[in-house]
């Protein structure tokens, strides 16, 4: 229904009416409608709504709505439904982000590998290397660094030391009778026990082998398939690597601080192979890279000399 | 009230150039737009182009420009067409109307050798 | 160019009839039109604007219609001072166009 009434709030345009040549001033539409009838000497103008699927989202003194954005591209989905007063709006759905005219799945960050940034709609995750201290065990898009499980707050030792990619395996001390205790300085073989790992303080003992100075740092030794990292962030998407080739392990050796040869201690050295068993697995996780720059938005802006 | 008062009759060689003037009384002249519109004998009536006084903005029919010039004196009230370059196709009864309302009384402009 | 399509380009009438004449545009116009009647030898006098508006001065004898796109000019009961030519005149966009005109004869 055309509506005529007159805001004191609402702006201004210029208008000619070209049947007379007069320049005239009219009110502006409210946004949602547009001037379907211009002012004259004798009358104000005349608004009517936006028909379905065109828009106006300012007052304006214009002639015909916009039209809205095309039905959003699969995958997208629509953020802002097409509305008198707004333009359809496309969005990627969760888990993915715009990257050029599409969406594009998260990268998802590999074991030994956590979220630095989280992804949102319009950019991508940011791993980054588990930290001394910290694991990751699954590939994802979501999940941080964890600490490892603090076996001795819990009463326990540690009887496999953590990885960039496993927990600490904590184990029980078994009880000794006054006479059958171990003489000083022999290691002695615990009760392993997984724990379920807790956001706790890690313990301090330092695993060898895979990287001597562990950290973020650009000079620390890198699975191959991460080796274009810079600053702790996973590949470009459009390198050769997609994560195929194998993420190589250096298992840690375990070693014990005291070196006297007791039989105790022969008898760890000979379990460790099969508690390490597990360690050397490959990783085939696709890893994908940040884009560079903004998206590309659906940018269906429209300027007239009338609106705004 | 309003009026357009036109200039009197041209007789020009070809090649030549004609200035028309119209006299707009009764109104703000620097208020509103004026148009000039040719009408030739059995050719129907074509649009020129207008001016707007109140800046001296002129918006031209493709098909004019480079052949005419719309002017205007603000202190007189009037509007001037030039006509350039002259021929026998430019003979018609030219007119200036405010908007398509208010018109003047034309015109006529004769090219002949 | 929008195309002003006239019709009838002549038509024979007898005093007190009721008379259309149609203009079809080219493109859709609104209500952008305006309608001229021009007597032999004279200048043009505004008849209607706006596609309804009648202009002062002039007889409610004469009416517009239409919008978008078909427009018609109607006379009704036609008196001796209105045998003449009508035009409609197309000013939504440049270059404004013209009908071809409408000879009113009386019969």
């Known amino acids: 229904q055309p509506e005529q009434k007159a805001s004191n709030l609402i702006g201004t345009y210029r208008h000619v009416d070209r049947a007379t040549g007069q320049v005239l001033t009219c009110d502006k539409c409210p946004a949602g409608t547009y001037v379907s009838e211009h002012c004259t000497n004798t009358s104000l103008r005349v608004c009517s709504s936006c028909p379905v699927g065109t828009f106006t989202r300012h007052e304006n003194g214009i002639e015909k709505c916009h039209d809205c954005s095309q039905p959003c591209p699969w995958p997208m989905i629509e953020k802002l439904p097409c509305a008198a007063l707004t333009d359809r709006e496309c969005t990627c759905p969760p888990g993915m982000f715009q990257s050029n005219a599409t969406c594009a799945p998260h990268t998802v960050c590999p074991v030994g590998w956590g979220v630095r940034k989280k992804g949102t709609e319009t950019e991508d995750v940011r791993c980054k290397q588990c930290a001394r201290g910290t694991f990751s065990d699954v590939p994802s898009s979501v999940m941080k660094c964890k600490a490892y499980t603090d076996c001795l707050s819990q009463n326990l030792v540690v009887i496999k030391p953590g990885t960039k990619e496993t927990d600490n395996v904590c184990g029980t001390l078994p009880s000794f009778s006054s006479s059958t205790s171990p003489s000083p300085g022999t290691a002695i073989f615990p009760r392993p026990e997984h724990m379920e790992t807790h956001e706790v303080p890690s313990s301090t003992y330092v695993p060898k082998g895979m990287n001597s100075t562990e950290s973020n740092s650009s000079a620390s030794v890198r699975p191959k398939v991460l080796s274009s990292i810079q600053e702790g962030t996973v590949p470009d998407n459009t390198s050769s690597a997609r994560g195929k080739e194998d993420v190589n392990k250096t298992l840690p050796n375990l070693q014990v601080v005291n070196h006297q040869q007791g039989p105790h201690h022969r008898h760890i050295l000979k379990l460790l192979p099969s508690m390490e068993a597990t360690g050397g697995e490959k990783s085939s996780t696709p890893i994908k890279g940040p884009k560079r720059g903004h998206p590309r938005q659906n940018l269906h802006k429209h300027f007239d000399i009338n609106e705004h | 009230q309003v009026q357009l008062q036109q200039s009197g009759p041209e007789v020009a060689r070809p090649g030549a150039s004609v200035k028309l003037s119209c006299k707009a009384s009764?109104?703000?002249?620097?208020?509103?737009?004026l148009n000039w519109v040719k009408q030739r004998t059995g050719q129907g009536l074509e649009w020129i182009g207008e001016?707007?006084?109140?800046?001296?903005?002129?918006y031209y029919n493709e098909k004019f420009k480079g052949k005419a010039t719309l002017t205007a004196d603000n202190s007189s009230s009037t509007a001037y067409l030039q006509f350039s370059s002259l021929t026998s196709e430019d003979s018609a009864v030219y007119f200036c109307?405010?908007?398509?309302?208010?018109w003047g009384q034309g015109t006529l402009v004769t090219v002949s050798v | 160019d929008i195309l002003m399509t006239q019709s009838p380009s002549s038509m024979s009438v007898s005093l007190g009839d009721t008379v259309s004449i149609t203009c079809h545009a080219s493109q859709g116009i609104r209500n952008s039109i305006g309608w001229l009647q021009q007597k032999p030898g004279k200048s043009f006098k505004g008849l209607i604007y706006?596609?309804?508006t009648l202009e002062d001065g002039v007889p409610s004898r004469f009416t517009g219609s239409g919008s978008g796109a078909d427009f018609s000019l109607t006379i009704s009961s036609l008196e001796s001072e209105d045998f003449a030519d009508y035009y409609c005149?197309?000013?939504?966009?440049?270059?404004?166009?013209f009908g071809g005109g409408t000879k009113l004869e009386i019969k």
């Open positions: 109307t405010r908007g398509v309302i208010k």
């Open positions: 005149v197309q000013y939504a966009q440049f270059p404004y166009t």
């Open positions: 706006h596609a309804t």
């Open positions: 001016i707007y006084p109140g800046n001296n903005h002129t």
């Open positions: 009764g109104y703000t002249f620097t208020d509103y737009y």
